[in-house]
């Protein structure tokens, strides 16, 4: 499956996005930081078949997708700038579930994805309880906004690779 | 009864690499991630890797990364961890660890064996 | 990497004696801060889960609270058997880390 050259600029436009949303200062937030545990190992594309690096290309978008759909979310972030943000991550996700469809059909999905998947689910839940213990503060949603760009950027490099590969 | 018995430990010398097994019964090992934790003779716990229960979801302690391959055979119930490079600083206990979810992360180490110790020296 | 604090590093305490051994994190863990206990020559054994949920087959006497970066491991009334060494342990994020462990010595 071939991702449409629109998904890449749609990826970069989210990011832009995202980067835009930013209302206060990183450097205020600093007593706020916080280690998430991103999965990078998940993201570094070299053990996956193309069928797995697309499922969990997938459910990164889904669950930044939802995190980013909940009202504590609305109330946090410029309404514009968040809808084309959620618009640009619902575009993705279209582009990614055909991908899905075509791929599944070509190689079966190992079970080891099954592992990537929950990993990226934990993941966000210890977001959510992030935000949950700082009481959807302004600094603790601006440290996730600094969270989901780093992210993203490790899925738009995963996805340039995927593309090489083709 | 639930078990988990290490095997492979032994005498190595520095730069010498080692294979540990782990061989796992009384639980339905495909279910349960497996991690290797470590302790030197005297001294505390280190972590050292871990394996979703699929095989996929590898993780490292940043002391081994690049010299330690973890990985598992469900059909078999056997945990392994492949090392290499093995220093002075690798000598201690390697226990195999069953944790409580199906891969690392927000949970608990709930089953141990009972170690193999692994001595680097010249 | 989240470091793992504990103390005291060693106690000693009479039997019957109520003992509480300390555990803090350097960022917040939420509630997945796990406690260890190790007899001598023995491998390590589960006894507190999540910070305060007690493993089947461990003694009453032992609870856990807390939740962020404060942990504590209560022994209410400290018994014989309870010699050992203690260990708290991150599990909210890998690399999963230990505390240094406590020494618990019967008097």
């Known amino acids: 499956c071939d991702l449409p050259q629109t998904h890449s600029l749609g990826n970069r436009r989210a990011l832009i996005l995202l980067a835009q949303m930013g209302r206060i200062s990183h450097f205020s937030c600093l007593k706020d930081r916080h280690d998430f545990g991103f999965p990078e190992e998940e993201f570094d594309g070299h053990q996956f078949q193309k069928a797995q690096a697309i499922s969990v290309l997938h459910e990164m978008i889904q669950q930044t997708f939802n995190l980013f759909s909940t009202e504590d979310s609305s109330a946090a972030w410029e309404q514009s700038l968040l809808e084309k943000f959620s618009t640009e991550l619902y575009q993705q996700l279209n582009d990614l579930e055909a991908c899905v469809i075509q791929e599944v059909g070509v190689e079966e999905t190992p079970l080891m994805n099954e592992d990537s998947i929950l990993a990226v689910r934990k993941y966000f839940q210890r977001i959510t309880l992030y935000l949950t213990e700082k009481k959807y503060s302004p600094c603790a949603w601006e440290v996730v906004r600094a969270e989901i760009m780093r992210s993203l950027s490790f899925s738009t490099n995963l996805q340039k690779r995927l593309r090489r590969k083709d | 009864e639930m078990q988990l018995m290490e095997s492979g430990g032994g005498l190595v010398q520095p730069g010498g690499s080692l294979r540990l097994s782990c061989v796992a019964s009384?639980?339905?090992?495909?279910?349960?991630?497996m991690s290797w934790v470590r302790q030197a003779p005297g001294k505390g716990l280190e972590w050292v890797a871990s394996?979703?229960?699929?095989?996929?979801?590898?993780y490292y302690a940043p002391s081994v990364k690049g010299r330690f391959s973890i990985s598992r055979d469900n059909s078999n119930n056997t945990l392994y961890v492949q090392m290499n490079s093995l220093g002075v600083e690798d000598t201690a206990f390697y226990y195999c660890v069953k944790e409580t979810d199906a891969v690392a992360t927000m949970d608990a180490l709930d089953m141990w064996g009972q170690g193999t110790l692994v001595i680097v020296s010249t | 990497d989240i470091r793992v604090t504990q103390s005291p590093s060693s106690l000693s305490a009479s039997v019957g004696d109520r003992v509480s051994i300390s555990c803090q994190t350097s960022?917040?863990?939420?509630?997945?801060l796990n406690w260890y206990q190790q007899r001598p020559g023995k491998g390590p054994q589960l006894l507190i889960s999540a910070a305060s949920t007690l493993q089947s087959g461990v003694p009453s006497r032992f609870s856990g609270s807390g939740s962020g970066t404060d942990f504590i491991l209560t022994i209410i009334s400290l018994q014989p058997e309870d010699s050992a060494s203690y260990y708290c342990?991150?599990?909210?994020?890998?690399?999963?880390?230990f505390g240094q462990g406590t020494k618990v010595e019967i008097k």
């Open positions: 960022q917040s863990v939420n509630i997945y």
């Open positions: 009384g639980f339905t090992f495909k279910s349960f991630a």
């Open positions: 342990q991150q599990g909210y994020i890998t690399p999963y880390t």
């Open positions: 394996v979703g229960s699929q095989g996929g979801s590898k």
